[in-house]
Interface confidence: low
């Protein structure tokens, strides 16, 4: 007949499981419950996946692993009396008088409930890694944390190599015994202990549960250390950089922590498991019953089979590990779960030229000397596309790509961003907004939706802001509709006349050169270089200024670079930026200073692209540690990551304009990194590649 095989992880658990099986049988509960002995939760998950067992209750981190690695699904959740439905919240608490925010945690002193505990360690550390605030090299999370905070109390970290830093704030009991023990001997252990560590001024931030502050302040705590504490003297750190009252934990937390749940194989009927357990809890969850599902006292242990604090078991409607864990906890787990044993020893970087091979070789040597992990290996390819193919085929691991290549890498090869380049704020040539500039003209004002029949000025054929993005955007929005993939003809028919300088004018529609003026002698008209006065972004703006065109497609800085005295050439000397406006995608017009909100797209920074199964945090962790040593162009450590001048080339491995490698944060897909507008423009253009 049908039976459910529960997996027990210890002798006491096996004992309780046997009793539960007997009690269920006695009560006539079907199907039969059998017990299988595993050695650990991990082992049980393997037994379930191998169809040698059927069910086990797991905590959030184990549910993540079981779901991601073994395809198991949660079907029954625990509900706890004291908690918020099937979850509680992990929060970061600070003194109200301090100025700490989530963005300024580096260097502060931290208080944790215990090593590897959910709210005291896993969630905050995972969150800090996943959000890019904390970089981890070579899966050495302990080292990363010990370097990040300015001393901590992490009970249980005394056995680790980083106890000096991670136990620095711990104090043991009143006689100094048990310092940093993962037990009540350490006064700063557990939720109340971590909060005490903050309250007594040992630490600046405490990672605890949403209820911890309220349970230990305002006279609610018996021990003398908390008698005078007021909840209003503490605040929560929110993920957006703000702070909030300690009662605002629903809105201001690091993550919602899911309850423990029963997991089974994907082919197991979750309803059946719930019916079995529901029948059981109906009969065996109250005091005085012959068997108590939610008590482990009789076995001399805690939390056997289910947490003792469980008040009821409930069916899980959406039976996926992602839905049960929720995106906040899921993200934190992604940041935390890094297995050093499964970390590849090498990161194979894709290189495209002889100078790049030389620079990559030097980078590999420099990184190895500093014991950076994983080690770099250099693998050459013929083109960016060839790199993508080789990465997909697992022959290479990483490559830095530009916007259009990121699009192809993501869409065609399934690659994802692992780190990005960041350029100086004043550097507008590497990451910029594409804008449509018009004259401020109240009598003949038109909008982006009314461009048909207007005269247009473009930097040049194929230029990102002058051609690709604006034309792609107009195609995507349905204004320009090319026939038989003939974009040039479609654009020439859409605008009344244009200037789109080009290098190879064969079969080029004459109207795309109609507004061009050539050089001072009227020669070289429409050529794709500066001999054409309307060439480039400055030239396209000049085309608008001199009334040749009605709209110019340029970078967001073009107007500022050529007005208000910033360009002394005669055509620009007297221009005022306030005489120009931007056309916005929503049909409005805006001041030229509103480019961040009124643009056709943002040209994204370059990004390092990898396979989706690559741990992006180890890639960023490596680059972040490396840039501390080699990121400054004036460093004396023998290698310059963001400079190619020693190799007689430019933009090798990374763009030379890069000032830092940055984490991708929430932009974990190619679409997220590129932004919707830029993707839409590229899709508009790529829809015409027949």
């Amino acid at each position: 007949g049908m039976e459910v095989r529960w997996c027990a992880t210890s002798d006491p658990e096996q004992h309780k499981c046997g009793n539960m099986s007997e009690a269920f049988r006695e009560a006539g509960i079907q199907p039969s419950l059998l017990c299988v002995r595993g050695t650990s939760a991990d082992h049980c998950v393997q037994l379930i996946a191998a169809q040698e067992a059927d069910a086990i209750t797991l905590d959030g981190g184990a549910i993540y692993e079981a779901g991601k690695e073994h395809g198991l699904k949660p079907v029954v959740g625990e509900v706890y009396d004291q908690e918020v439905g099937t979850s509680y919240y992990a929060v970061a608490v600070v003194r109200r008088s301090s100025h700490v925010t989530i963005d300024t945690l580096k260097g502060v002193k931290s208080c944790h409930t215990g090593i590897n505990r959910t709210v005291g360690w896993n969630v905050p550390v995972g969150y800090l890694v996943e959000s890019g605030r904390l970089s981890v090299m070579g899966c050495d999370v302990l080292k990363a944390v010990s370097d990040y905070f300015g001393g901590s109390c992490v009970p249980g970290a005394g056995e680790t190599s980083y106890s000096e830093s991670l136990c620095r704030l711990c104090r043991g009991d009143s006689s100094g015994e048990g310092v940093c023990d993962k037990s009540p001997l350490e006064r700063y252990y557990d939720y109340s202990g971590a909060f005490r560590c903050l309250a007594e001024g040992a630490g600046d931030v405490a990672f605890v549960k949403h209820s911890t502050v309220l349970e230990n302040t305002d006279g609610k705590t018996l021990p003398s250390w908390g008698q005078a504490l007021l909840s209003q003297d503490f605040e929560l750190l929110c993920r957006d950089g703000s702070r909030a009252d300690v009662t605002e934990w629903r809105q201001c937390h690091l993550a919602r922590v899911p309850a423990h749940a029963v997991v089974v194989r994907a082919d197991t009927d979750g309803g059946l498991i719930f019916r079995l357990l529901n029948e059981g809890q109906r009969l065996f969850s109250h005091e005085g019953s012959s068997f108590q599902m939610f008590s482990s006292e009789a076995y001399g242990q805690k939390d056997l089979l289910f947490k003792d604090s469980t008040s009821e078991l409930v069916p899980i409607a959406t039976q996926t590990y992602e839905a049960w864990l929720g995106h906040e906890y899921l993200h934190a787990m992604k940041g935390l779960l890094c297995d050093p044993n499964r970390l590849p020893p090498y990161l194979r970087w894709c290189v495209l030229s002889t100078p790049e091979i030389q620079k990559c070789g030097d980078m590999a040597v420099a990184f190895r000397r500093q014991r950076l992990k994983p080690e770099i290996q250099c693998v050459s390819a013929k083109s960016p596309q060839h790199c993508m193919e080789r990465i997909q085929a697992e022959q290479v691991d990483a490559v830095t790509l530009s916007g259009e290549d990121i699009y192809t890498a993501g869409k065609t090869y399934g690659l994802v961003p692992a780190a990005g380049e960041h350029y100086a704020p004043e550097d507008s040539s590497n990451s910029y907004y594409v804008v449509a500039v018009v004259r401020r003209d109240s009598s003949h004002a038109f909008t982006l939706d009314e461009l048909r029949g207007k005269r247009s000025c473009h930097a040049g054929f194929g230029s990102p802001a002058g051609w690709d993005v604006p034309v792609g955007a107009l195609i995507q929005r349905g204004f320009i509709r090319p026939k038989d993939c003939d974009v040039l003809t479609a654009v020439s028919e859409f605008f009344n006349a244009s200037c789109v300088p080009v290098n190879n004018p064969k079969n080029y529609p004459s109207s795309l050169c109609a507004l061009c003026v050539g050089d001072e002698q009227g020669r070289n008209k429409c050529v794709g270089n500066s001999q054409e006065r309307y060439y480039g972004y400055r030239g396209a703006f000049r085309c608008l200024v001199e009334n040749a065109g009605d709209v110019a497609f340029v970078r967001h800085t073009t107007v500022f670079d050529n007005t208000n005295g910033h360009n002394s050439e005669p055509w620009a000397a007297e221009l005022r930026s306030e005489d120009y406006e931007l056309l916005c995608p929503n049909g409005a017009r805006a001041e030229v200073s509103q480019f961040a909100a009124c643009n056709l797209a943002q040209i994204p920074p370059h990004a390092v692209m990898v396979r989706p199964d690559t741990n992006i945090f180890t890639v960023y962790g490596l680059l972040d540690k490396a840039q501390d040593l080699f990121g400054d162009d004036h460093n004396k450590n023998g290698f310059k990551m963001f400079d190619s001048s020693n190799y007689h080339g430019q933009d090798l491995l990374f763009k030379d304009a890069t000032v830092r490698a940055v984490p991708v944060g929430e932009k974990t897909t190619y679409r997220g990194w590129l932004g919707l507008d830029y993707v839409a423009a590229l899709e508009g253009m790529s829809s015409q590649q027949c």
Epitope: R250, A317, T318
Partner: antibody, heavy 119, light 112 residues
Framework: EVQLQESGPSLVKPSQTLSLTCSVT??????GYWNWIRKFPGNKLEWM?????????YYNPSLKSRISITRDTSKNQYYLQLNFVTAEDTATYNC?????????????WGQGTSVTVSS | DFVMTQTPLSLPVSLGDQASISCRAS???????????LHWYLQKPGQSPKLLIY???NRFSGVPDRFSGSGSGTDFTLKISRVEAEDLGVYFC?????????FGGGTKLEIK
């Protein structure tokens, strides 16, 4: 024991707004789903919408443009507003609870309050 | 919306008899998670509706075991093994597999 009690005017003029209150005792409206259902003359029942423990609302698409469900957790009450009523909205209005424990069946109902729409 | 059709409209019975009420759904009520969210309610005269059976066959707490639910897919049945006077009233089936939840038209159980 969980108890729900509806209150509000029994007569509403056409085109005006119908406003009802459901007072809950024996359970907190910060857990579960808190619903409004109405029963028309002739026994036809219609589910109108709910407000969840986290304050999220879901409405029957047939009423979406006219209905609003809100709550006051400090009073343990939740409310129904139905705009632009017509004679077709004449019905007995019930509030009810749904929880995971009964797979979102409505395990506890209020007594119901009769509302007539007439000028 | 998902239409729930109840038969009969009225069911005259003698006390102690067995009563059977049918409920048919316009589409299958099996959720993608494998569960079937079909429930039964009783509204006695002058009272609020009471939950009898949830998810096809689960009796709600306090409901006598003479009430039983069965069925699958689109066809469901509520049975009362021995009708007592306190069982009289209007019985409704309801589904919450699909959104929005919908109800059957009701079956009036009355004494012959």
């Amino acid at each position: 024991e969980v108890q729900l009690q509806e209150s509000g005017p029994s007569l509403v003029k056409p085109s005006q707004t119908l406003s009802l209150t459901c007072s809950v005792t024996g359970d907190s409206i910060t857990s579960g789903y808190w619903n409004w259902i109405r029963k028309f003359p002739g026994n036809k029942l219609e589910w109108m919408g709910y407000i969840s423990d986290s304050g999220i609302t879901y409405y029957n698409p047939s009423l979406k443009s006219r209905i609003s469900i809100t709550r006051d957790t400090s009073k343990n009450q939740y409310y129904l507003q139905l705009n632009f009523v017509t004679a077709e909205d004449t019905a007995t209005y019930n509030c009810a609870r749904r929880t995971l424990a009964t797979y979102y069946a409505m395990d506890y109902w209020g007594q119901g309050t009769s509302v007539t729409v007439s000028s | 919306d998902f239409v729930m059709t109840q038969t009969p409209l009225s069911l005259p019975v003698s006390l102690g008899d067995q009563a059977s009420i049918s409920c048919r759904a316009s589409q299958s009520l099996v959720h993608s998670n494998g569960n079937t969210y079909l429930h039964w309610y009783l509204q006695k005269p002058g009272q609020s509706p009471k939950l009898l059976i949830y998810r096809v066959s689960n009796r709600f707490s306090g409901v006598p075991d003479r009430f039983s639910g069965s069925g699958s897919g689109t066809d469901f049945t509520l049975k009362i093994s021995r009708v007592e006077a306190e069982d009289l009233g209007v019985y409704f089936c309801s589904q919450s597999t699909h959104v929005p939840p919908t109800f059957g038209g009701g079956t009036k159980l009355e004494i012959k």
